[in-house]
């Protein structure tokens, strides 16, 4: 067992041209905060997947506002560092995650925006025990200052903290009138083969064949406590003594154990039970626990279901992470189809759809001309989700509403007599023209120069009666079917306009909440 | 072991005021949004209250029914959260819990002060 | 605002019973949606978030399901200390609401 530790001194803008000024968006004032991932092994893992050695993050840093003219500084960090506590052997290559997250300061539903900054990720090779290693990253504009460090927790040493040992003797202050206690070493597993004979609870040897005594305890094989009135002062403890330091208190005395651990005295040593949430030697290293109020946005914190998994942040929708500190983009996934708009409520996500389309993801593609009848005849004309109407003679307007006058723009030629009738105008041709708009000249022998065209009806004509009443029939049978298909169309789209308003009325309702 | 202890109810008239107080104990408060649910036999039990933490400027929601009479606020130093009730209605009556918010459900609830407001 | 219905105020039990209390939204929410049990005289206990989640100490006789608007807590083997009124609540939206509450008595 062991602590993996980070120290974060400097997050900032990178050298060179376009480095951001500031890590905070046009919304105003936010701070900073880190989260650092282990993963085992140099495979190039997806940032994703479970931290397998641990995972941390930092407190929040204090609020950062962009000063207008002052130069990009190195940005307020939070303070203190990061540990990341394994239970097993430190593996000894691993990758490192380094994720800089920006906590957009402001009211929203769910909690504050927030947003990965920056993430870098390094693969490592680290012996525990080692000293400080540093390193500076730069992940897109912004550049990362760190250090980090292994180290292993009592009893565990080594470089990979494999090793179990116990202190040599139990943690002791020298009596009045004798000298200070020599520091004494640790001793590990596989220790050298002592005397025979030499006890296994109060000697040791530091030799093959060795018998020492630990304090209170003398003989050759340190089997013999020693009587306190026998002490000759300042000698030290010996294997061929029988003079010794007195025995200070017991190890449990005083209690070593931290975070009300519970102390049980061990051979020479002692041993801490700790409560739930601490561990170490002396139960001086806190983990997180649900008290700590790990879960961001509103999460809720639940106590793991063993130990090795202190708690559980179950998150409110839109937020994911193991604390519930990443906002998911739903809108990134382009749900909304036929070029809606998406918008992501945070709890709820919706579609404003364009013209012509209708349904929660704007799925239904709708006629352009459903509902949206041309009046007065008027026939709609689709085209790219828009509509517009080509009216019958006599009306105009985007719909076809306003009444036109025919005659206004004088369409009958060489002084012919416009007429307006309600499928139109008809020309009355001054002699020696003819035509729907008097635009072709009569010869004297009869003979139209354009003899394809047909002849225009002049006032008299015995046809111009029959003609006329052949168009009226016409012209109403195209409004009649043009009416029964507008009719069908609305009552077919009906029920999508009905559930697209509704939507928008609650869509409007919850950005205003 | 979380603990919440409510304060300040009474009996009050009509268009009176009162302060509600709630002091937390057990867990780290500072990271925690609050809230104050009430509960009366007419009403049921009725979300009143929410504060979020410093980082988000202590924003506040309200139940549409006590906007502008009621305010919400917390001292994270002294791990409490209060409740000031303006322009008291009889509708107001109920017992007022403190409870650990968050949006995902309420974990943790105090024992409750009851708010009488009669004539 | 977001209407949760418990449309039995009452429901008569024996020991050892299966019981489903139901509760209905007025517009979807998801599974955003909480149960809480409150003992006479006691403050009310978070059972059951996110649907069907138990929170921390919660038996594992009381489980929930549904989603979008209609939901069920689901007592199997009913015990004694169950005797209590039960309240589901959504937190799709501001504000928050809470249902009117089923009381479980004994037949």
């Known amino acids: 067992a062991g602590v993996f530790e980070l120290q974060i001194h400097s997050f900032g803008p990178g050298p060179g041209p376009g480095a951001p000024r500031s890590p905070c968006s046009a919304r105003g004032p936010c701070r900073l905060f880190f989260r650092v991932c282990l993963k085992p092994g140099l495979s190039e893992e997806a940032a994703e997947s479970p931290c397998a050695l641990g995972a941390a993050l930092s407190a929040r840093g204090p609020v950062y506002t962009e000063q207008p003219e002052a130069p990009a500084p190195d940005l307020p960090l939070p303070n203190g560092l990061l540990q990341v506590p394994f239970r097993d052997a430190w593996p000894g290559t691993f990758s490192l995650i380094i994720e800089t997250w920006r906590e957009e300061l402001g009211d929203q539903i769910g909690g504050p925006a927030w947003s990965l900054l920056a993430r870098v990720t390094r693969r490592r090779r680290l012996a525990a025990g080692g000293p400080w290693a540093r390193d500076i990253q730069r992940a897109g504009a912004w550049e990362l200052r760190f250090s980090y460090r292994a180290r292993c927790e009592l009893p565990a040493v080594g470089t990979a903290c494999t090793r179990l040992c116990r202190p040599r003797s139990a943690p002791s202050r020298c009596g009045p009138g004798l000298r200070p206690c020599a520091p004494l070493e640790d001793e590990c597993e596989a220790p050298p083969v002592c005397r025979a004979g030499c006890s296994l609870e109060h000697g040791f040897c530091e030799q093959p064949g060795e018998c020492r005594c630990l304090e209170g305890w003398t003989g050759p094989l340190c089997m013999v406590p020693v009587s306190t009135s026998s002490c000759l002062g300042l000698r030290g403890p010996s294997s061929t003594t029988t003079g010794c330091l007195v025995p200070g208190p017991g190890p449990c005395d005083g209690n070593p154990c931290a975070n009300g651990g519970s102390c049980s005295e061990t051979p020479g040593s002692f041993e801490c039970t700790c409560p739930r949430g601490f561990y170490g030697l002396r139960c001086e290293v806190s983990g997180v626990t649900c008290a700590d109020g790990p879960c961001f946005n509103g999460g809720l914190c639940v106590g793991g279901a063993d130990p090795d998994s202190a708690y559980i942040c179950h998150c409110p929708p839109g937020f994911q992470g193991s604390n519930c500190e990443k906002r998911v983009d739903r809108c990134s996934l382009q749900p909304c189809r036929n070029g809606g708009l998406c918008l992501d409520l945070g709890h709820a996500l919706r579609c404003r759809c364009r013209a012509g389309f209708a349904g929660p993801r704007c799925e239904h593609d709708l006629d352009d001309c459903a509902g949206r009848a041309c009046a007065n005849g008027g026939t709609c004309v689709e085209g790219g989700g828009a509509h517009r109407c080509s009216c019958a003679l006599g009306f105009g307007g985007r719909n076809c509403r306003e009444r036109a006058d025919p005659c206004a723009a004088r369409p009958c030629a060489h002084g012919g007599r416009c007429y307006a009738h309600f499928s139109g105008l008809v020309c009355a041709c001054a002699p020696g023209y003819m035509g729907a708009r008097c635009e072709f000249p009569v010869h004297p022998d009869g003979v139209s120069a354009l003899p394809a065209a047909p002849p225009g009806l002049r006032p008299g004509d015995p046809q111009r009666a029959g003609v006329i009443a052949v168009i009226v029939v016409v012209v109403i049978a195209i409004v009649a079917g043009i009416v029964v298909l507008v009719i069908s169309r609305k009552k077919r789209m009906a029920k999508y306009e009905k559930a697209e308003i509704k939507e928008m009325g609650e869509m409007h309702r919850e950005l205003n909440a | 072991e979380v603990n919440l202890e409510e304060s300040g109810g009474g009996l009050v008239q009509p268009g009176g005021s009162m302060k509600l107080s709630c002091v937390a104990s057990?867990?780290?408060?500072?990271?925690?949004?609050m809230q104050w649910v009430r509960q009366s036999p007419e009403k049921g039990l009725e979300w009143v209250a929410q504060?979020?933490?410093?980082?988000?400027?202590?924003?506040?929601h309200y139940a549409e029914s006590v906007k502008g009479r009621f305010t919400i606020s917390r001292d994270d130093s002294k791990s409490s959260v209060y409740l000031q009730l303006n322009n008291l209605r009889a509708e107001d009556t109920g017992t007022y819990y403190c409870?650990?918010?968050?949006?995902?459900?309420?974990?943790?609830w105090g024992q409750g002060t009851l708010v009488t407001v009669s004539a | 605002d977001i209407v949760m219905t418990q449309s039995q105020k009452f429901m008569s039990t024996t020991i050892g019973d299966r019981v489903s209390i139901t509760c209905k939204a007025s517009?979807?929410?998801?599974?955003?949606v909480a149960w809480y049990q409150q003992k006479p005289g006691q403050s009310p206990n978070l059972l059951l978030y996110?649907?069907?989640n138990r929170f921390t100490g919660v038996p594992d006789r009381f489980t929930g399901s549904g989603s979008g608007t209609d939901f069920t807590l689901t007592i199997t083997n009913m015990q004694s200390e169950d005797l209590a009124d039960y309240f589901c609540?959504?937190?799709?939206?501001?504000?928050?609401?809470f249902g009117g509450g089923t009381k479980l008595e004994i037949k």
């Open positions: 057990g867990f780290a408060f500072s990271n925690f949004w």
């Open positions: 609540q959504q937190y799709n939206n501001y504000p928050l609401t």
């Open positions: 517009q979807n929410v998801g599974t955003t």
């Open positions: 409870t650990q918010g968050n949006w995902v459900g309420f974990a943790y």
């Open positions: 996110s649907t069907s």
């Open positions: 504060i979020r933490l410093k980082s988000d400027n202590y924003a506040a």
